[in-house]
């Protein structure tokens, strides 16, 4: 799948939601930041991206599998068993609902209202029976309980 | 498509400084992070800077801190390198690359522009 | 800083035969929470800028030829040219994106 294919608007979830949490010690560090004078914090900024951008890409996979002509390289890789693995071996858990209902619930409307839109529709379309078996399997392991608990953890209402 | 084209570079003398700037189109600049790397004939490829989408974080190779600065106008879609008290190690083609959805993954680079430090 | 070393630093193989490249990791770039490899390859044909080939080790970016494919985990990698076309002739690279990204030696592919 291509990298290139999806723009990230409203400056999402991978772009926006990496940034190191705004305390007071944080600050210091965020001036430290803009002078250049820490190098190590970019492998801590680089290890705070890590889960995101996997959420990240499998949000663009979805929103990238109802373009028809963008479909290629994601059914060669699923025919691969490939793509399913991916999910699976991060995704082991619970049912979408509980993410969604996390989401929609407001803890993260106000930061993420264009993926907030997404699961919803999701969870719509799954609701109503229209998403293929492979999307269903996606979405029921979308909500891990470790990555709901990282979010959590990271008090992403905080972040910048 | 995308494109990104730098602009910039030529001889410079050892301690003195150049600008370097980078022109996006075709994609949406202002959502993604950006990187300079630079591409030296003994030292190979060298991660030079990077600056988050909207210029709140920014972080540099050990080699370049404290004299290079990263910085980008999102209203005019133009990543910049400020580089000062350059020496010969800086010598290298230096490309500005978009970063993918996946951090320090670069999807796409620039046809690069030449900095020559020499007396 | 993860050190990438790439073996060998150049190699030629007639066309239509397979070339491989080796590239090692001074550490582990496997991230376990989503036994996802941060490894990438790059293509870079004569005054050209580095191309994005292969990113997680094994996936194939968008419009990259099937004949190329990425295997390995933990610390060493493999790229696979399966059958060589004249137009591979290039320097390849692997990246590491785990940290600090850092780059290969490059390995120049020619034919034979």
């Known amino acids: 799948r291509s990298l290139q294919d999806t723009e990230e608007k409203s400056r999402s979830f991978s772009a926006s939601q990496a940034d190191p949490l705004s305390d007071p010690d944080q600050m210091n560090e965020d001036k430290r930041h803009s002078q250049g004078t820490f190098t190590s914090d970019y492998s801590k900024y680089l290890d705070s991206r890590r889960a995101q951008d996997f959420v990240q890409w499998l949000m663009n996979t979805k929103r990238n599998r109802n373009n028809i002509a963008k479909r290629h390289d994601e059914f060669e890789r699923h025919a691969e068993g490939t793509f399913t693995s991916d999910v699976s071996s991060y995704l082991e858990g619970q049912a979408a609902k509980e993410f969604i209902a996390w989401l929609v619930k407001g803890r993260g409307r106000r930061d993420f209202p264009e993926e907030v839109a997404i699961v919803e529709e999701l969870g719509r379309r799954h609701a109503d029976g229209s998403f293929s078996d492979e999307m269903n399997t996606i979405l029921d392991n979308l909500a891990a309980r470790d990555f709901i608990n990282w979010l959590i953890q990271t008090k992403i209402t905080d972040r910048k | 498509q995308v494109q990104l084209v730098e602009s910039g570079g030529g001889v410079v003398q050892p301690g003195r400084s150049l600008r370097l700037s980078c022109a996006a189109s075709?994609?949406?600049?202002?959502?993604?992070?950006m990187h300079w790397v630079r591409q030296a004939p003994v030292k190979g490829l060298e991660w030079v800077a990077f600056?988050?989408?909207?210029?709140?974080?920014?972080y540099y190779a050990d080699s370049v801190k404290g004299r290079f600065t990263i910085s980008r106008d999102n209203s005019k879609n133009t990543l910049y390198l400020q580089m000062n008290s350059l020496t010969a190690e800086d010598t290298a083609v230096y490309y500005c690359?978009?970063?993918?959805?996946?951090?320090?993954?670069?999807?796409?680079w620039g046809q690069g522009t030449l900095v020559t430090v020499s007396s | 800083d993860i050190v990438m070393t790439q073996s060998p630093d150049s190699l030629a193989v007639s066309l239509g035969e397979r070339a491989t490249i080796n590239c090692k990791s001074s550490?582990?770039?496997?991230?376990?929470?989503?036994?996802?490899?941060?490894l990438a390859w790059y293509q870079q044909k004569p005054r050209q800028p580095p191309k994005l080939l292969i990113y997680?080790?094994?996936i194939r970016e968008s419009g990259v030829p099937d004949r190329f494919s990425g295997s390995g985990s933990g610390t060493d990698f493999i790229l696979t040219i399966s059958s060589l076309q004249a137009e591979d002739v290039a320097v390849y690279y692997c990246?590491?994106?785990?940290?600090?990204?850092?780059f290969g030696q490059g390995t120049k592919l020619e034919i034979k």
């Open positions: 550490q582990s770039v496997l991230y376990s929470s989503n036994n996802k490899n941060y």
């Open positions: 690359a978009k970063e993918s959805i996946l951090a320090a993954l670069f999807d796409y």
């Open positions: 075709g994609f949406t600049f202002s959502s993604y992070g």
């Open positions: 600056i988050s989408y909207d210029g709140s974080n920014k």
């Open positions: 990246q590491q994106f785990y940290s600090i990204p850092t």
């Open positions: 997680w080790a094994s």
